[in-house]
């Protein structure tokens, strides 16, 4: 790696991937192994982030750029970086202190994580059940008894997808 | 209910060895690792070493020629060993599940070294 | 190995105070510090994971925030049962690490 010639900041001119190493006169050395640098004129390579346990790689760390962790198979991550995993449970469970529950009647999870949601109140909308409700899938409301009258279209789209009712119809 | 208990607490002798065993209930040690922690009279907390879920182990470097961490997973178990204790090595010992962060721990295992 | 710093190692308050802990990384950890709070005889128990995120059943009155190497823990209005030993510490990278940890004392 050549010296840098900026009179100004001679760490400048340094690129990603490497650090402006003050022990050998601010030439740009290249990071040592299982660091980074995102961004040029650095004086320091940062350490890589280790995946490891209920953590797996996700994109192995470069010279120019960190690691990133996911959760192994069997479980999701929590918080925004992947800070914690938590175990899926199947769809129309919920995970509790106790470990997965079924979600209790009237109350439905179609994913692998997350809360048991109450079924959507079609009644609130006026509407009426078209499909009953399961613990991994929600109502499906139709239109209103009164829609449904001699002469009236009998099929409705389903109403689009609001939040859950507070009680099961 | 996730739990981890501890072996009993013990006096160990100075250049002796200590023993923990951490019994776990409520997960599968098949699924989960299990990392060992200690923590000496009013001071904070020392990572030690982990067991993974594949059985592979990490050690702090500090502790890697007398630490020794297995497991059995059909008795839901994992042991710890450490060889040549001293009167520094007086601390409380836990073990705590894998989750990427400390969410569920033993109750810890009181360990003094003297003669 | 990461060198992670609490401070203050001791502070005196009263019911109701707000206040700050800190915690400082040797190096650039990211987002990869969690918080636990220690009652007397008690194993740590986890506040916070990711720097900012409140573990299930924490009460909103803790707030964790900072990143790379600048962590704070914040208690909005302290209660007495808060009282007791905090510790931060980094799972961004082996061996991982913890501070020496701080005393909440009453005024």
């Known amino acids: 790696f050549e010296r840098t010639r900026s009179l100004q900041d001679p760490c400048s001119n340094c690129p990603a991937g490497t650090f402006c190493d003050n022990n050998r006169n601010q030439i740009c050395s290249p990071c040592p192994p299982n660091s980074f640098s995102s961004a040029g004129g650095q004086r320091t390579c940062d350490i890589c982030r280790q995946c490891k346990g209920v953590f797996r790689t996700r994109k192995e760390c470069s010279s120019t750029s960190n690691a990133e962790c996911d959760c192994t198979p069997g479980f999701h991550c929590l918080g925004a970086g992947c800070s914690m995993c938590e175990q899926d449970c199947k769809q129309g469970q919920e995970l509790t202190k106790k470990g997965c529950k079924d979600c209790c009647f009237g109350t439905f999870n179609d994913q692998k994580r997350g809360i048991c949601r109450p079924w959507t109140n079609c009644s609130l909308d006026g509407k009426s059940v078209l499909v009953n409700g399961t613990k991994e899938r929600d109502v499906v409301c139709g239109p209103s008894p009164a829609d449904l009258s001699p002469g009236a279209s009998s099929v409705t789209p389903p109403a689009p997808a609001r939040e859950p009712g507070h009680s099961p119809q | 209910q996730v739990q981890l208990k501890q072996s009993r607490p013990g006096l160990v002798q100075p250049s002796q060895s200590l023993s923990i065993t951490c019994t776990v209930s409520g997960f599968s040690l098949s699924i989960y690792g299990v990392h060992w922690i200690r923590q000496p009279p009013g001071k904070g907390l020392e990572w030690l070493g982990a067991i993974w879920s594949g059985g592979s182990t990490d050690y702090n470097a500090a502790f890697i020629s007398r630490l020794s961490i297995s497991k059995d997973n059909s008795k839901s178990q994992v042991f710890f060993k450490m060889n040549s204790l001293q009167a520094d090595d007086t601390a409380i010992y836990y073990c705590a599940r894998d989750d990427g962060s400390f969410a569920y721990w033993g109750q810890g295992t009181l360990v003094t070294v003297s003669a | 190995n990461i060198v992670m710093t609490q401070s203050p190692k001791s502070m005196s308050m009263s019911v109701g105070e707000r206040v700050t802990l800190r915690c400082k990384a040797s190096e650039n950890v990211g987002i990869y510090v969690s918080w636990y709070q220690q009652k007397p005889e008690q194993s740590p128990k986890l506040l916070i994971h990711?720097?900012?995120n409140r573990y299930t059943g924490v009460p909103d009155r803790f707030t964790g925030s900072g990143s790379a190497t600048d962590f704070t823990l914040t208690i909005s209005s302290v209660q007495a049962e808060d009282l007791v030993d905090y510790h931060c510490?980094?799972?961004?990278?082996?061996?991982?690490?913890f501070g020496a940890g701080t005393k909440l004392e009453l005024k």
């Open positions: 510490g980094q799972s961004y990278s082996y061996p991982l690490t």
């Open positions: 990711g720097a900012t």
